[in-house]
Interface confidence: low
């Protein structure tokens, strides 16, 4: 998260850390007691590693309460999400067991209706992504709110050029941004989760370079077969 | 002005059945987490069910699992605990809490009704 | 289940005076505790949470502070509106537990 600041502690308990061999690699958010929903383009970066997810947690190193590793029973990446294109970039991970929930753990609402979120609605983008251009990783939980941006404009020549579709939406990234290693993380509008971090190796914190969010809306009977 | 009013409580038998309601108002209720909890006559507090917005998340203590159930009814802006199998050791007075809305805090409750007192005892 | 212990349960005071009331976890909580003031016949009232941060509209002379297992909540300048009961309560893991209360009283 560029621009942003430190969140809350644990005030975001559906946030997840999705890991392999130990390491943050995404963000996630937790949609259902068992399921965590994070981007496609991250399991790309796994390798043969071993993709884990960890709930409850604040800090990445230090010991917390709340905070669980699970393993992940199952990997389902959207069927049409392909390497070369940030198009249907949304993953489902199934914990090998329910999350235990708690204050620090539970599920985030997800939006079921499909249409846009207003242009200039201040939305919440938190991730354990890099924090400044020189490549700084944090150790807590960093925050930003950003507006989101018209997709007319997001798809000027000068900005994404026709690439977001309507399955996408924009948010403004003028010096405040999401960035590398929050993908997969949560857009939060309202209080409802709107969009999911898309994972392309998009220049963080350029204004004529939107960030560019998966709309859960427009995946609803996609989430809800596999949750199912 | 955010009121919580609860209702129902009264004197009811060992292993009998009452159903408390609170009505909100003053603020969008669809919008809040919601709990019961209650005090005992020696003042200590006791948290007993929790309902997430669309009441798709409840949670109890050991205490009343499987005696109390927690609802909504977000169109009439209405939260209900339904208790059964009474104990004398659920006597207390119960409040309708409203938990505020992330990310200001967690579970703590930042409104309380008045409370409606429930009386266990043959 | 975490138990949080008021080891008080009166405290004596006098109005311009401060006052510590403390509160210590069972376990670690980070800083997942509130604190609520209960006048005489009255509901509850959230004065701080996530240990330190002061509800909407508390006056400032209530001050929270700690984290791990040990947390105080700290009146300074003490008024007799102030005398009531104080509830902690931590909220970092279920069941939502609170403390016993402690009766801040006129000396």
């Known amino acids: 998260i560029l621009g942003g600041r430190e969140a809350e502690a644990h005030a975001r308990p559906y946030m997840a850390s999705v890991q392999v061999n130990g390491e943050h690699l995404c963000g996630g958010v937790l949609v259902a007691e068992q399921w965590v929903l994070s981007a496609a383009h991250c399991l790309e970066d796994a390798a043969d590693g071993k993709v884990q997810v960890l709930l409850g947690a604040h800090s990445l190193s230090q010991p917390e309460p709340s905070k669980r590793l699970y393993d992940v029973l199952r990997a389902v990446p959207h069927p049409d999400s392909r390497p070369d294109t940030i198009d249907h970039d949304l993953l489902l991970l199934q914990l090998s067991e329910k999350a235990t929930l708690g204050p620090a753990v539970r599920p985030l609402p997800w939006q079921r209706v499909d249409r846009d979120v207003e242009p200039g609605t201040l939305c919440d983008v938190a991730g354990w992504g890099i924090v400044s251009h020189a490549g700084r990783r944090p150790d807590r939980l960093q925050h930003v709110l950003l507006p989101v941006l018209d997709r007319a404009t997001c798809n000027r020549r000068t900005h994404h050029d026709g690439a977001i579709t309507q399955r996408m939406m924009c948010a403004e990234s003028n010096r405040r941004d999401s960035c590398k290693g929050d993908s997969g993380g949560p857009l939060v509008c309202g209080g409802v989760l709107e969009g999911v971090v898309t994972s392309g190796s998009r220049v963080c914190g350029n204004r004529k370079k939107p960030g560019i969010y998966t709309r859960v809306a427009s995946y609803a009977a996609w989430i809800d077969s596999v949750l199912a | 002005e955010v009121q919580l009013v609860e209702s129902g409580g009264d004197l009811v038998k060992p292993g009998g059945s009452l159903k408390l309601s609170c009505a909100a108002s003053?603020?969008?209720?669809?919008?809040?987490?919601m709990s019961w909890v209650r005090q005992i006559p020696d003042k200590r507090l006791e948290w007993v069910a929790i309902?997430?917005?669309?009441?798709?998340?409840?949670y109890y203590p050991d205490s009343v699992k499987g005696r109390f159930t927690i609802s909504r009814d977000n169109a009439k802006n209405t939260l209900y605990l339904q208790m059964s199998s009474l104990k004398s050791e659920d006597t207390a007075l119960y409040f309708c809490?409203?938990?505020?809305?992330?990310?200001?805090?967690?579970?703590?409750?930042?409104?309380w009704g008045q409370g409606t007192s429930v009386t266990v005892s043959s | 289940d975490i138990v949080m212990t008021q080891s008080h349960k009166f405290m004596s005071t006098s109005v311009g005076d401060r006052v510590s009331i403390t509160c210590k976890a069972s376990?670690?909580?980070?800083?997942?505790v509130a604190w609520y003031q209960q006048r005489p016949g009255q509901s509850p009232k959230l004065l701080i949470y996530w240990a330190s941060t002061r509800h909407t509209g508390v006056p400032d002379r209530f001050t929270g502070s700690g984290s791990g297992t040990d947390f105080t909540l700290t009146v300074s300048n003490v008024q007799s509106e102030d005398l009531a009961d104080y509830f902690c309560q931590q909220y970092t893991s279920y069941p939502l537990t609170f403390g016993a209360g402690t009766k801040l009283e006129l000396k």
């Open positions: 376990q670690d909580v980070g800083t997942a």
């Open positions: 003053g603020f969008t209720f669809s919008g809040y987490g």
């Open positions: 309902s997430s917005r669309d009441n798709s998340f409840t």
């Open positions: 809490t409203r938990h505020p809305y992330l990310p200001t805090g967690g579970y703590v409750m930042d409104y």
